[in-house]
């Protein structure tokens, strides 16, 4: 049975040209995290493997930096970066937990962070 929950930075906004940290945290489970994948739609942004470290997809290498921790830093933001981002926690023995973050990149200088909130939804991948 999967008992864990993923807490994320939730709905966030940032200014065009700036940077933002995407962060997820898995709690309430003793499952071992073997890998965390960061994704945007059908694009794989990065993989953080517990043994092997970080792999940033070549398409994103100039604008994505690993960390802090298991998080991901997006740099030189454009309006096209607006959208859903997912952290996929591959764990043993639980399976897969998914967290969702919505990022809005704003033209103006009025950009605020949304509140952190918990995502109760998770699914188990066999």
């Amino acid at each position: 049975m999967m008992t864990g929950t993923i807490e994320t930075t939730g709905n966030i906004s940032a200014e065009k040209g700036g940077s933002i940290i995407l962060q997820c945290h898995l709690s309430s489970t003793t499952a071992q995290v073997t890998q965390v994948n960061w994704e945007q739609q059908d694009q794989l942004l990065a993989i953080c493997n517990a043994d092997l470290g970080w792999h940033i997809s070549p398409s994103f290498k100039d604008r994505v930096a690993p960390g802090p921790g298991l998080g991901l830093t997006l740099q030189s933001l454009t309006v096209n970066d607006t959208g859903e981002y997912f952290c996929i926690y591959h764990t043993y023995p639980d399976g897969t937990y998914t967290g969702r973050i919505f990022l809005e990149v704003l033209e103006s200088s009025v950009a605020e962070h949304g509140a952190r909130f918990q995502i109760p939804h998770h699914h188990h991948h066999h």
Epitope: Q35, Q43, L44, D51, L52, S57
Partner: antibody, heavy 120, light 107 residues
Framework: EVQLQESGPGLVKPSETLSLTCAVS????????WNWIRQPPGKKLEWIGY???????YYNPSLKSRVTISRDTSKNQFSLKLSSVTAADTAVYYC??????????????WGQGTTVTVSS | DIVMTQSPDSLAVSLGERATINCKAS??????VAWYQQKPGQSPKLMIY???YRYTGVPDRFSGSGSGTDFTLTISSLQAEDVAVYYC?????????FGGGTKVEIK
């Protein structure tokens, strides 16, 4: 240039332990990930597992109970042990390097492979 | 485990013609796919990583495309030295898995 060379017996008896070594030259095994991959005759390539730059190991769950990958940093080599072998373990065994940072799980350097037959 | 299914099993193409190899993943692997070339009696060689990026020294007649579950390796103009078996591999999650291979021959 990175070079990998497998060595070990070509014939192993059923129920015994298969032991192979991979000697690495041109690169230190304290960087990157060092893998064993096999190819049974007429079948898919099968990833067996790796030992990381730090010495951590990960094994394919289908073989986990029988596999041990270890390393000897002083000799710059790593080894595979597969216990309780059967005819299904007959395959060409490759050692390989994986530069995870640059290429993810794509294997960029392979040994030439060594054929292991399990037979009495 | 994620199953990678290649088609066709074999392919005969005239010299200078286009060869297209398909690979289907049993679940969404985004762009975490590599392609390898294995010539008779040799070990596999990395050709494409991250679905569409050519590895160092790979001729530009080789290209990869796709994301999600469907991927393609294309040889735009087949040369005699391209005769080989080609394998796809996913590295979206462990255990990393390979396709069954596609044999490319000259017609």
């Amino acid at each position: 240039e990175v070079q990998l060379q497998e060595s070990g017996p070509g014939l192993v008896k059923p129920s015994e332990t298969l032991s192979l070594t991979c000697a690495v030259s041109g690169y230190s095994i304290t960087s990157d990930s060092w893998n064993w991959i096999r190819q049974p005759p007429g079948k898919k390539l099968e990833w067996i597992g790796y030992i990381s730059y730090s010495g951590n190991t990960y094994y394919n769950p289908s073989l986990k109970s029988r596999v041990t990958i270890s390393r000897d940093t002083s000799k710059n080599q790593f080894s595979l042990k597969l216990s309780s072998v059967t005819a299904a373990d007959t395959a060409v065994y490759y050692c390989a390097r994986l530069d995870f940072s640059n290429y993810g799980g794509a294997v960029d350097y392979w040994g030439q492979g060594t054929t292991v037959t399990v037979s009495s | 485990d994620i199953v990678m299914t290649q088609s066709p099993d074999s392919l005969a193409v005239s010299l200078g013609e286009r060869a297209t190899i398909n690979c289907k993943a049993s679940q969404n692997v985004r762009t975490a796919v590599a392609w390898y070339q294995q010539k008779p009696g040799q070990s596999p060689k990395l050709m494409i990583y991250s679905a569409s990026y050519r590895y160092t020294g790979v001729p530009d007649r080789f290209s990869g495309s796709g994301s999600g579950t469907d991927f393609t390796l294309t040889i735009s103009s087949l040369q005699a030295e391209d005769v080989a078996v080609y394998y796809c591999q996913q590295y979206y999650t462990t255990p990393w898995t390979f396709g069954g291979g596609t044999k490319v021959e000259i017609k």
